[in-house]
Structures are given as C-alpha cells and as structure tokens.
C-alpha cells in the first residue's frame, strides 16, 4: 500500500524519494509520474532525470534537493485538490528487473479559512506573493534546453524559498530510500 502524504490547498507538497548513488556523479535515471507505477517507466510524467541532469519537467513540479546526491524528492508548487492522488517515483537501475518503484499517495486538504476581523481583507495575506521561475510563454511542458537563462542552481534556490523546510525535514525521515552499489 502507498505511503500517504498531506498538504493544504495553496501550499507546496513534498513527496520524498531518495537513492544513494554508487559513486558521486554516478546518477541513475529517475522518473516521477501521476498515477501508480506501471510495468516500466512512469505514465503521465511530470519530471524526469537522466544520468546527468533534470531533462524534463512540467510546470509546478521541482526537485528541490540535491538530486546529484540521490535526493529526488518531488515538490509540487501551490497545490490544488486536483493534485490529490498517487504518484510514482521510479529509480531506473540498470540490469534485469532492477527498477525501484515507490507509490506515494498525496492527500490535499482544503485550506483553513480564517475569518477576517473586518470586511476589508488583507489582500496580501489572502494571496501571498509566489516566487516563480516561469515567464517563458504559455508552454506547459518545458525542458532545460528551452530555458537558457535559468540554470539548475537558480531553479533549486528559488524553489527552496517556496518549501516549508520544517515539513520537508519531518517527511525526509520517512521517505523512500534505496542504496545502489
């Protein structure tokens, strides 16, 4: 059965997944998909890495940790109820039937609504400013090749500002981890 993780509407969700590279920089391809892990690869891919880099992602999905050290935990930015469901983290270890598959269940709860003391609401509090690295047009799917002015370090730095670090640290201890080599 899937391990369950929770987040509120409007927050960032964190889905932990880790592996230990056999040697520094000796990376293994990883894919994240919406839906349970199928027979091979990931369906409905939202993000993937190859032996070197993040080579595909869709908007709102980030690897905030150091994926070069095996932290391939997924952050989903500004979640909605539609983000609920099972996610597949697949660590594609070479060989015969060596893939490690993890199904993680994300439960999104409605945001807690705090009644305003007066009729005039604080717009900033209700709609906090979101940091984003987008702004490259309407394309929903983008690859690193189409983002020449943003590097992985910048993406990671910006995304880290969005993460609730306490939640991340709490969840890290219960994350899916495997050791390679």
């Amino acid at each position: 059965s899937e391990v369950e993780y929770r987040a509120e509407v409007g927050q960032n969700a964190y889905l932990p997944c880790f592996y230990t590279p056999a040697a520094p920089g000796n990376l293994v391809p990883v894919c994240w998909g919406k839906g349970a892990c199928p027979v091979f690869e990931c369906g409905n891919v939202v993000l993937r890495t190859d032996e070197r880099d993040v080579n595909y992602w869709t908007s709102r999905y980030w690897l905030n940790g150091d994926f070069r050290k095996g932290d391939v935990s997924l952050t989903i930015e500004n979640v909605t109820l539609a983000d609920s469901g099972i996610y597949c983290c697949r660590i594609q270890i070479p060989g015969i039937m060596n893939d490690e598959k993890f199904n993680l269940k994300l439960v999104i709860k409605p945001a807690k609504v705090t009644p305003a003391p007066t009729r005039q609401r604080d717009f900033t509090a209700a709609f906090p400013r979101m940091l984003t690295t987008r702004g490259h047009g309407p394309a929903e799917t983008q690859t690193l090749g189409s983002l020449p002015d943003i590097n992985l370090t910048q993406i990671s730095t910006l995304a880290n500002e969005l993460r609730d670090s306490r939640l991340a640290n709490d969840l890290r201890d219960s994350g899916a981890t495997i050791r390679i080599g």
Epitope: G35, V39, Y56, Q92, P94, G95
Partner: antibody, heavy 123, light 108 residues
Framework: QVQLQQSGAEVKKPGASVKVSCKAS????????MHWVRQAPGQGLEWMGI????????SYAQKFQGRVTMTRDTSTSTVYMELSSLRSEDTAVYYC????????????????WGQGTTVTVSS | ETTLTQSPGTLSLSPGERATLSCRAS???????LAWYQQKIGQAPRLLIY???SRATGIPDRFSGSGSGTDFTLTISRLEPEDFAVYYC?????????FGQGTRLEIK
C-alpha cells in the same frame, strides 16, 4: 518507414533453445522500448518481456524468468529473444513490438510490430 | 496479475452497424495504461487505441475508446467490411502486461 524485420521460422526439439532476431529500421533504435509477445496457434496474445535498447535493461514476465533472455546489438539495431528448455507448449508465433513510449511522449501501446516468427517445437 | 475479461466472445454484426466491445479488469487500471488492438488472420496485431481513448496514428475516427477503473469499451460507430477481425484489450498497469482473451467480430 518504420519497420521491424524478424528472422525466419524455426523447428526445434524439446529441450533445445531458440534465438529470434528483430531488426529495426526507420527510427532511432535506442529511443524506444521493445517487447516480445507470443501467440500459440488459435490462442490469444501473451507478453513475454521488454528490453530497453538504450541501456539493455530488461523485465520479463514471471512465467518466463529463467528461460528467456533478451539482448540487443545497437550497432545493427537488432534485438534478440532467446528461449531455452523448449517444450511443445512453446510452439507459437513470436512477435517483437515497439512501444510508443519515448522521450516527451509518455503513453503506452505497441505501435509497430514485426511480421512474426513461427517456432515449432516437436520431437 | 491483472486479468482482462472481454465480452462478448463473439459478436455477429452487419456492415454499417455499431459495435460495442467490453473489457473488464480484475483490478483497477489507470486509463493511461489501457490499449486496444485489432488482429486479422495471419497478420500481426495493430494498435488502435492507447490511453483508453486516444486513437493511434492512421486509425479512422469510427474507432473510439472510453472507460476508467475496471470497465473499458471499444466502439466502432459504423462497421466497414475491413473491421471484421479479433480485438484485444491490454493493460500496462501491473506486471506482467496482460491482454484480454479477445473478441471475435464476425459478419452476420
């Protein structure tokens, strides 16, 4: 055009092994997974396993584990399926089939098939 | 193992009629992982539908797929003479990949 060309028919004795080849052309060989599916006379389709031509990783149906080996030769864009310890129930047409799934197109389905290789196991 | 049960086993219809083929899974299958194939005698199968409802390249729009969970349907809106064949559903959701036993569509 995209094509999968399989090797010719084989007749084998029980206990022997057979190796079927499947040569791909018309596309980037290492960009698509390849399946092996068999069909016994008058029967339905049975999945045997899959190989990733890029790295050579494989996954086999449990029914065939220990008897089947799938390999590839990237220099000739060819995949191979070897089945050992043959028995009469292995008499079938063996197909290789390319999967749709590829970088940027994350859907599943066997979109290109070889013409099939008939393997007859008889004493 | 996910078992796919197709019904009916044989369907007898005339050209121009509508055909509805059913595929029921023993456990829930994501629609992303469900495909349909057509096979004619002496030929390799041909992919018709992937992702439960997306037509493969070159497939006429009289073929359509639908369904989710455990119940999926292939519909042929107006049968043409070349549509009489055996049809298989297939799932990728759990290992091994499995096919239904097939529905034989024959001319009435």
């Amino acid at each position: 055009q995209v094509q999968l060309q399989q090797s010719g028919a084989e007749v084998k004795k029980p206990g022997a092994s057979v190796k079927v080849s499947c040569k791909a052309s018309g596309y980037t060989f290492t960009s698509y997974y390849m399946h092996w599916v068999r069909q016994a006379p008058g029967q339905g389709l049975e999945w045997m396993g899959i190989i990733n031509p890029s790295g050579g990783s494989t996954s086999y149906a449990q029914k065939f584990q220990g008897r089947v080996t799938m390999t590839r030769d990237t220099s000739t864009s060819t995949v191979y399926m070897e089945l050992s310890s043959l028995r009469s129930e292995d008499t079938a047409v063996y197909y290789c089939a390319r999967d749709l799934y590829s970088y940027g197109f994350y859907y599943y389905g066997m979109d290109v098939w070889g013409q099939g290789t008939t393997v007859t196991v008889s004493s | 193992e996910t078992t796919l049960t197709q019904s009916p086993g044989t369907l007898s219809l005339s050209p121009g009629e509508r055909a509805t083929l059913s595929c029921r899974a023993s456990q829930s299958v994501s629609s992303s992982y469900l495909a349909w194939y057509q096979q004619k005698i002496g030929q390799a199968p041909r992919l018709l539908i992937y992702g439960a409802s997306s037509r493969a390249t070159g497939i006429p729009d009289r073929f359509s797929g639908s369904g989710s969970g455990t119940d999926f349907t292939l519909t042929i809106s107006r049968l043409e003479p070349e549509d009489f064949a055996v049809y298989y559903c297939q799932q990728y959701g759990s290992s091994p990949i499995t096919f239904g036993q097939g529905t034989r569509l024959e001319i009435k």
